[in-house]
């Protein structure tokens, strides 16, 4: 079985649509792919992180529609039966099995565009998406392990003498918290049923010449730094300032 060749240097395209949602696509330039396409004999699987609440477009291998017999999208989401959306060129018919999410649709009429779109990506869209194209020359596949990214809510506060708490709430995947300067720190992770993780880092600084500390939160959706001035008064709280 053949498959379309991924372009390793591909950058994620992001644009704004009319409804002000960012749109992500891993679709490649048609000419560029068709040249690579017939050379590869393995199924292509791409891990694709996508921000929640954006729109995503997933593409089939770049087979000329004139060579197509059947296109099938298989969608496997956690805890749900496998959904399939199929199009048969000969009869110009589409069929669906176990597909209940109305936000996952063909981009347009499948006889014109075989791509699949997810409107307003949600955590529930985490899963595996595969396009199977059947042609007289063989079956061509492209699969996506879609990882939905959720930006954590970051807070920083002082809870007692020379101790600060930095929280990255409900991120997906878990955020990483680091401090400047380094202190005596303990980090806890709390896992939520929807797949998000809250990371809480509590740090204490004995050294009295440390007056300002910075919490740096690293996450796939972007990094954030907050700083706070350590107060000597026990129990006092001071809100953080954002860099």
């Amino acid at each position: 079985e053949g498959a379309a060749q991924p372009n390793n240097s591909l950058m994620l395209q992001t644009s704004k649509e009319n409804h002000a949602l960012a749109s992500s696509s891993l679709c490649m330039d048609e000419k560029q792919i068709t040249q690579n396409y017939s050379k590869v004999l393995a199924e292509v699987n791409t891990s694709w992180p996508v921000k929640m609440a954006t729109n995503a477009v997933l593409c089939c291998p770049p087979i000329a529609l004139r060579n197509l017999i059947i296109i099938t999208w298989e969608i496997i989401l956690r805890g749900q039966p496998s959904c399939t959306k199929a199009y048969k060129k000969e009869t110009n018919e589409t069929k669906e099995t176990n597909c209940t999410d109305e936000r996952i649709t063909w981009v347009s009429r499948p006889d014109q565009n075989s791509d699949l779109q997810i409107r307003t990506v949600a955590i529930t869209h985490d899963g595996y998406y595969r396009c199977i194209m059947v042609t007289p020359d063989g079956n061509f596949h492209r699969g996506y392990h879609l990882q939905v990214l959720v930006t954590p809510e970051v807070t920083l506060f002082q809870n007692r003498n020379r101790t600060a708490v930095c929280k990255a709430v409900a991120g997906k995947p878990a955020a990483h918290i680091s401090w400047i300067p380094e202190g005596d720190c303990a980090t806890k992770q709390e896992y939520w049923s929807n797949g998000t993780v809250t990371v809480k880092s509590t740090c204490h600084w004995e050294v009295h010449n440390v007056s300002t500390v910075t919490c740096h939160v690293s996450h796939l959706t972007g990094n954030k730094s907050l700083y706070i001035e350590l107060l000597p008064v026990p129990g006092a709280k001071k809100s953080a300032k954002l860099y």
Epitope: I69, I70, K95, D137, G138, N139
Partner: antibody, heavy 118, light 102 residues
Framework: QVQLKESGPGLVQPSQTLSLTCTVS????????VSWVRQPPGKGLEWIAA???????FYNSALKSRLSISRDTSKSQVFLKMNSLQTEDTAIYFC????????????WGPGTMVTVSS | DIVMTQSPTFMSISVGDRVTMSCKAS??????VDWYQQKTGQSPKLLIY???NRYTGVPDRFTGSGSGTGFTFTITNLQAEDLAVYYC?????????SGAGT
């Protein structure tokens, strides 16, 4: 529930035209395609013709010149006409519905026996 | 036209046995092969669609596998009521074609 029932003459003279009707219930012909499949006595299944949900018509290339498939969506009926019948066209003729989820035949009529004989 | 070659033609087996039959397509049909059971005097009944998907209400002793040109249909723990002719049929493109039956 979904049902299909074939009706036809039973006996046809050689060189004559066969007219079959498939009457369906429990689904709309604009949602599911219907095919005709035949089975000569003691033999396997032979697909003859189909009409898609959109009204497109498709034929077995070996029989195409002799076949015509049509439908009346308001009456929920699919028609098959086959001319120039020969004894080798003797068979049980089934109509079958395209599935909701894919292109398989999920419901079949009981079949109607057509004998070509003088 | 796509030719579907089914084997064996006949099988003589016992209740409780495992039965395997195969179907070979003359060209690539993807996973677009369906398996039907036909008992004497009845119309065919869909068991497996898209090569490996069990149709609604079909017991799990019936399984299918394969892709491309080679397909297999298996019945485990054969029951007396499974006595029938089994057909594979490609539903990739018209004309749909079936094997001669097992």
């Amino acid at each position: 529930q979904v049902q299909l029932k074939e009706s036809g003459p039973g006996l046809v003279q050689p060189s004559q035209t066969l007219s079959l009707t498939c009457t369906v219930s429990g689904f709309s012909l604009t949602n599911n395609g219907v095919s005709w499949v035949r089975q000569p006595p003691g033999k396997g299944l032979e697909w003859i013709a189909a009409i898609s949900s959109g009204g497109g018509t498709f034929y077995n290339s070996a029989l195409k010149s002799r076949l015509s498939i049509s439908r009346d969506t308001s009456k929920s009926q699919v028609f098959l006409k086959m001319n120039s019948l020969q004894t080798e066209d003797t068979a049980i003729y089934f109509c079958a519905r395209d599935g909701d989820w894919d292109w398989y035949f999920d419901f079949w009529g009981p079949g109607t026996m057509v004998t070509v004989s003088s | 036209d796509i030719v579907m070659t089914q084997s064996p033609t006949f099988m003589s087996i016992s209740v409780g046995d495992r039965v395997t039959m195969s179907c070979k397509a003359s060209q690539n049909v993807g996973s677009n092969v369906d398996w039907y059971q036909q008992k004497t005097g009845q119309s065919p009944k869909l068991l497996i669609y898209k090569a490996s998907n069990r149709y609604t209400g079909v017991p799990d002793r019936f399984t299918g596998s394969g892709s491309g040109t080679g397909f297999t249909f298996t019945i485990t723990n054969l029951q007396a009521e499974d006595l029938a002719v089994y057909y594979c049929m490609q539903s990739l493109s018209f004309p749909y074609t079936s094997g001669a039956g097992t």
